[in-house]
């Protein structure tokens, strides 16, 4: 609806009256409107609302509103709609970031790696290797490395030390009278041969001579995965290598205990870039195409101390 009344705070603009050639000073129209009729010696300027598909951000003296930008190209979504006061703004949906005028999925940090820096709509996730004492057992674009389960605090012992990719497996020593096998339904995380694990305090070991193996594993490339929920854990890079171990060495009869420890229990830290979280030593790399500084190929450990 045309508006004729000018606010006291509205600025002015100059307009040349075509009929008389006279330079007139008119009141500007408010944002979201345009000048449908300029002022004359005897009348105020007339403002009209911007038609659909157009806008003006500020008070103005223009005769036509600006056209809004084109609809957001897939896969972008509208951050701001086209309205009388605002132009359409496009952004990348959750789990993606703007790259070369389109949206690319956030890098998925592979197993053994955690998120060092969260991704945003304009910046990719940055991954880091889990450091000593931490691990990541699922590919994720939101989760940091998690600290190993503290078996001792649960009055249990470590029957399988954690790696960058697996948590400690806790268990109890059976009584001499009965030998118990792992209870059904509990997962004993397999540790591939030739895998380096993080050092675990010796006080948590019961089986003697059980050192983790060390060597390289080839990196496995996984497809990108979109994740919209941020895990609250922070990475901690504190892993250390242990001596060689005969992976096939049999353990004494130990009972495996379910940890029931979700990522929300974990606190991870980043120190030197790796002071974030780290876990086992198996090589894997963040899944992504050529991207700035994301780890590729080998395992990378930064001095980080992050906590979940």
């Amino acid at each position: 609806q045309p508006e004729q009344k000018a606010s006291n705070l509205i600025g002015t603009y100059r307009h040349v009256d075509r009929a008389t050639g006279q330079v007139l000073t008119c009141d500007k129209c408010p944002a979201g409107t345009y000048v449908s009729e300029h002022c004359t010696n005897t009348s105020l300027r007339v403002c009209s609302s911007c038609p659909v598909g157009t806008f003006t951000r500020h008070e103005n003296g223009i005769e036509k509103c600006h056209d809004c930008s084109q609809p957001c190209p897939w896969p972008m979504i509208e951050k701001l709609p086209c309205a009388a006061l605002t132009d359409r703004e496009c952004t990348c949906p959750p789990g993606m970031f703007q790259s070369n005028a389109t949206c690319a999925p956030h890098t998925v940090c592979p197993v053994g790696w955690g998120v060092r820096k969260k991704g945003t709509e304009t910046e990719d996730v940055r991954c880091k290797q889990c450091a000593r004492g931490t691990f990541s057992d699922v590919p994720s674009s939101v989760m940091k490395c998690k600290a190993y389960t503290d078996c001792l605090s649960q009055n249990l012992v470590v029957i399988k030390p954690g790696t960058k990719e697996t948590d400690n497996v806790c268990g109890t020593l059976p009584s001499f009278s009965s030998s118990t096998s792992p209870s059904p339904g509990t997962a004993i995380f397999p540790r591939p041969e030739h895998m380096e694990t993080h050092e675990v305090p010796s006080s948590t070991y019961v089986p003697k001579g059980m050192n983790s193996t060390e060597s390289n594993s080839s990196a496995s490339v996984r497809p990108k995965v979109l994740s919209s929920i941020q895990e609250g854990t922070v990475p901690d890079n504190t892993s250390s290598a242990r001596g060689k171990e005969d992976v096939n060495k049999t353990l004494p009869n130990l009972q495996v205990v379910n940890h029931q420890q979700g990522p929300h229990h974990r606190h991870i830290l980043k120190l030197l870039p790796s002071m974030e979280a780290t876990g086992g030593e198996k090589s894997s790399t963040p899944i992504k195409g050529p991207k700035r500084g994301h780890p590729r190929q080998n395992l990378h450990k930064h001095f980080d101390i992050n906590e979940h």
């Epitope: 940055r126 504190t238 450990k301």
Partner: antibody, heavy 115, light 110 residues
């Protein structure tokens, strides 16, 4: 046994350059993030730079950004720190450290920047 | 000035309990793991505590670490003369996108 041995330190004039090396042994070097941490005489520890295991990503303290370059040669199990445009305040013992947790450190090499 | 604040010194007699504090903020200690390092006179630092409260093998159980909120602490029970050293806390800082160290605490055994 994990061992880290730094070398390359010495006396250099302001504006000069030095290249530090850290020879690693006793572990799978290519699997670890590595870092440089320094300690000025009588002062505390200051993180300088870190590099991923593959060398794919590097991080630098603001105080050395643009002047220092961290790199590694996994085939030689060696970490490097190229230091250019050295200043008096860069005088320190430079340590290399393994892993994000800095679980093992070298014995350090002294860099003195003085005219 | 360090992002992490430690008392410059702490002392105790043999057998006593000494605690060193390390104060930070949400962007560092509050959201990340804390590490502690011991530096004996004239030697390189050594990892003492990782992921807030874990000890590497070889570190006596007299040393314990804890974290609460934006602060962490290192406790030494049954203080011994060989514990005389500088102790540093460290963590990652999300805002700086870098590791940070405390200024260090010199522990003296009286």
């Amino acid at each position: 046994e994990v061992q880290l041995l730094e070398s390359g330190g010495g006396l250099v004039q302001p504006g000069g350059s030095l290249r530090l090396s850290c020879a690693a042994s006793g572990f799978t070097f290519s699997n670890y993030e590595m870092s440089w941490v320094r300690q000025a005489p009588g002062k505390g520890l200051e993180w300088v730079s870190s590099i991923y295991s593959s060398g794919g990503e590097t991080l630098y303290a603001d105080s050395v950004k643009g002047r220092f370059t961290i790199s590694r040669d996994n085939s030689k199990n060696t970490l490097y720190l190229q230091m250019n445009s050295l200043r008096a305040e860069d005088t320190a013992v430079y340590y290399c450290a393994r892993d994000g947790a800095a679980d093992y450190w070298g014995q350090g090499t002294l860099v003195t920047v003085s005219s | 000035q360090s992002e992490l604040t430690q008392p410059p010194s702490a002392s105790g007699t043999p057998g006593q309990w000494v605690t060193i504090s390390c104060s930070g903020s949400t962007s560092n200690i509050g959201n990340n793991y804390v590490y502690w390092y011991q530096q004996l006179p004239g030697t390189a630092p050594k990892l003492l505590i990782y992921t807030n409260n874990q000890r590497p093998s070889g570190v006596p159980d007299r040393f314990s670490g804890s974290k609460s909120g934006t602060s962490a602490s290192l406790a030494i029970s049954g203080l011994r003369s060989e514990d005389e050293a500088d102790y540093y806390c460290a963590t990652w800082d999300d805002s700086l996108y870098a590791p940070v160290f405390g200024g260090g605490t010199k522990v003296t055994v009286l």
